[in-house]
Structure formats: structure tokens, C-alpha cells
């Protein structure tokens, strides 16, 4: 069975929501208007998922390959460091922040970005197939 | 094409009070942080006060703090800059200006600014 | 609060030659700097930003360098629109201070 927590590992379950792309273990929600990040988090919350936590440089090569230029906010944040809403440090590659108010992190197909946590973009969400379920 | 437009500039006595507004136009006002810069005659630019997207946040040099209030309104396209206790310091030329964006809190765009005189 | 100090404040030169003006910051701000240029009676124009990152529109002959306290600003051949001043600026954090100017005068 699927259950747990939303940042395991997922099992090779069979289907994801509507207008939610299938991509290896996971579903990926890649959204069609903006808000700022902290509205981007409780959208994904509220799908029982959160925002895109990259595990590895692969799987951020992969995603890539579905954007533009335009950024889309993830689950990263910058807390005395960048780190994942997962709490692991961002450890596969770079960011900087040009200014102090720049604490959240964005994705497009060039790479991460460091930006205002109000500006409003894009984002994407991350969760097992079948709502709130992963593999323990 | 970005423009910024300033006004409300003028005469005023040393005590006195003045609101400034810059008029936005030639980009979405609402995804960017603002910035107001002054110039004294034949002096340097110095930074006056920056507001947040939502306006919930604003920053000011001290040299101003509690004197000068920045505001917006995201309907109007409009920056304002609130003035009081007015010096015969504050005497310069205002510009409005907008970050690079994202945060990105360089002057990439500037008005054409206000010329601002505090004299008796 | 940083200080930022630009030098020369003023410097005579002639179209094409190459003009360098410096930028030091009172302690390390990594590449946190801004250029603009200013012509008298204008708004400042802006040119450069994270130390070498060129604006959009910005002619080439226009260069940034340095990181950490030391920048420089380079015109590799002065045109006769380059008359005028320049200004450094810290643009990371509280407050946003800019350098004194350095006023590029005509030989």
C-alpha cells in the first residue's frame, strides 16, 4: 500500500488527478496562473501535495525540459541557508540572492532562481499517484 | 515602454509637508518593487525609501526614517511619497524609480523626477 | 552602514580612449554592485548590475569587473555620449548607498 509521508519515496502507483502529469513515481501540477509563493504552498497543501522538492540534479534536468523561460516557484527556501520545504539543504546546485528580499527559489528551463517571495509566478506541485500517498 | 511619471513637487517652508505620486505605466506595477531616489543640487543620488509588491513592507535610510512614508496603490499604478518635518536638506530633485525585478533591488527604470525646494 | 567610494571624483579624457573608474566598498559585498550613468539635467541611466552584468541596450564598450570591496567600471573607447557621471551603487541590502560620482569630463 501507498501511505505516509508526502516527501517518501513513491510507490509505482498507476494514475495521477486530472491536469496532473505523470513522471516517473510522481504527479507533477505545473500551473496555468500565478500567485506569490506563500499562496503557491497552500495551493499545493490543500491538493495533498507540496511544492517541488527536487531531489537530484536528474530530476531537475528532467523538469526542465517541461518549462520556459518563465519561473515557477518550488518548495525551496532561503532560512539562514536555501533549503528544501522537506528541511534537506539544497545540495546539487547553486543559487544566489542578488538582495536581501530574494528568499524563495524558482525554477525555469535555464536553472534556479532566487526571488521576492511576493512576485507572482507560476508554480509546481508534487505528489504520489492517488492523493496523499507514498510509499513508507 | 516602461514610464515612470513624477509629481506634486514644489515650494515648501521647513516644517512643512508634501506629497509626492509617481504614475506607472508600460508594465504590470503589481509584480515589482519601487524605490524613491533623490539629488540635491550638484550633490550625489542618494535612496530615499523602497515598498514591497504588496506594500507591507518599506524601507527607509535613517536620514529620513520617520519623516517620509512611502505607499501604493496597485489599482492606481501609482507610487506616492508622503513628506513631513520638512529640512532645508530634503531641497533636491525625486526620482521614482522600479527594481530589475524579482526582487532584484537595482534602479533599472527611472522617472524623470520633481524638483522638491524647502526654503522660508 | 556600507560606504561606497568612487575614484577618481573626475577624470579628463579624449573620444576613444579607455577609461577606467574604480569602486570600493567599505567591506566585502560580494558582487552587489550597480553602474549608472548620469548626463546633466537627465535621470540617471542604468548600466550595470551584479558588478559585470550588462543592461539591456547597453553598448559593449561598457565592462564591470571585481567582486568582494574592489569594482571598476571600463569604457574600452569613449564615445562623445559617454560625457558624463557615473555612479557605483551597493544594491544587496539596507541602506542602498551609492558612490559620490565620478564626473568624465572632455579632454
Known amino acids: 500500500l501507498c501511505q505516509g509521508s508526502n516527501y517518501s519515496t513513491c510507490a509505482s502507483c498507476p494514475s495521477c488527478p486530472d491536469r496532473w502529469m505523470k513522471y516517473g513515481n510522481h504527479c507533477y501540477y505545473f500551473s496555468v496562473e500565478e500567485k506569490d509563493w506563500n499562496s503557491s504552498l497552500e495551493f499545493c497543501l490543500a491538493r495533498d501535495s507540496h511544492l517541488l522538492v527536487i531531489t537530484d540534479n536528474q530530476e531537475m534536468s528532467l523538469l526542465q525540459v517541461f518549462l520556459s523561460e518563465a519561473f515557477c516557484w518550488i518548495g525551496l527556501r532561503n532560512n539562514s541557508g536555501w533549503r528544501w520545504e522537506d528541511g534537506s539543504p539544497l545540495n546539487f546546485s547553486r543559487i544566489s540572492s542578488n538582495s536581501f528580499v530574494q528568499t524563495c527559489g524558482a525554477i525555469n528551463k535555464n536553472g534556479l532562481q532566487a526571488s521576492s517571495c511576493e512576485v507572482p509566478l507560476h508554480w509546481v506541485c508534487k505528489k504520489c499517484p492517488f492523493a496523499d500517498q507514498a510509499l513508507f | 515602454e516602461v514610464q515612470l511619471v513624477e509629481s506634486g513637487g514644489g515650494l515648501v517652508k521647513p516644517g512643512g509637508s508634501l506629497r509626492l505620486s509617481c504614475a506607472a505605466s508600460?508594465?504590470?506595477?503589481?509584480?515589482?518593487?519601487m524605490s524613491w531616489v533623490r539629488q540635491a543640487p550638484g550633490k550625489g543620488l542618494e535612496w530615499v525609501a523602497t515598498?514591497?509588491?504588496?506594500?507591507?513592507?518599506?524601507y527607509y535610510p535613517d536620514s529620513v526614517k520617520g519623516r517620509f512614508t512611502i505607499s501604493r496603490d496597485n489599482a492606481k499604478n501609482t507610487l506616492y511619497l508622503q513628506m513631513s518635518s520638512l529640512r532645508a536638506e530634503d531641497t533636491a530633485v525625486y526620482y521614482c524609480?522600479?527594481?530589475?525585478?524579482?526582487?532584484?533591488?537595482?534602479?533599472?527604470?527611472w522617472g524623470q523626477g520633481t524638483l522638491v525646494t524647502v526654503s522660508s | 552602514d556600507i560606504q561606497m567610494t568612487q575614484s577618481p571624483s573626475s577624470l579628463s579624457a579624449s573620444v576613444g580612449d579607455r577609461v577606467t573608474i574604480t569602486c570600493r566598498a567599505s567591506?566585502?559585498?560580494?558582487?552587489?554592485l550597480a553602474w549608472y550613468q548620469q548626463k546633466p539635467g537627465k535621470a540617471p541611466k542604468f548600466l550595470i548590475h551584479?558588478?559585470?552584468t550588462l543592461a539591456e541596450g547597453v553598448p559593449s564598450r561598457f565592462s564591470g569587473s571585481g567582486s568582494g570591496t574592489d569594482f571598476t567600471l571600463t569604457i574600452s573607447s569613449l564615445q562623445p555620449e559617454d560625457f558624463a557621471t557615473y555612479y557605483c551603487?551597493?544594491?544587496?541590502?539596507?541602506?542602498?548607498?551609492f558612490g559620490q560620482g565620478t564626473k568624465l569630463e572632455i579632454k
Open positions: 524609480a522600479r527594481e530589475g525585478g524579482y526582487g532584484n533591488l537595482w534602479f533599472a527604470y
Open positions: 508600460g508594465f504590470t506595477f503589481s509584480r515589482y518593487y
Open positions: 515598498i514591497s509588491i504588496s506594500g507591507g513592507n518599506t
Open positions: 567591506e566585502n559585498i560580494y558582487s552587489a
Open positions: 551584479q558588478a559585470k
Open positions: 551603487q551597493y544594491h544587496y541590502g539596507i541602506p542602498f548607498t
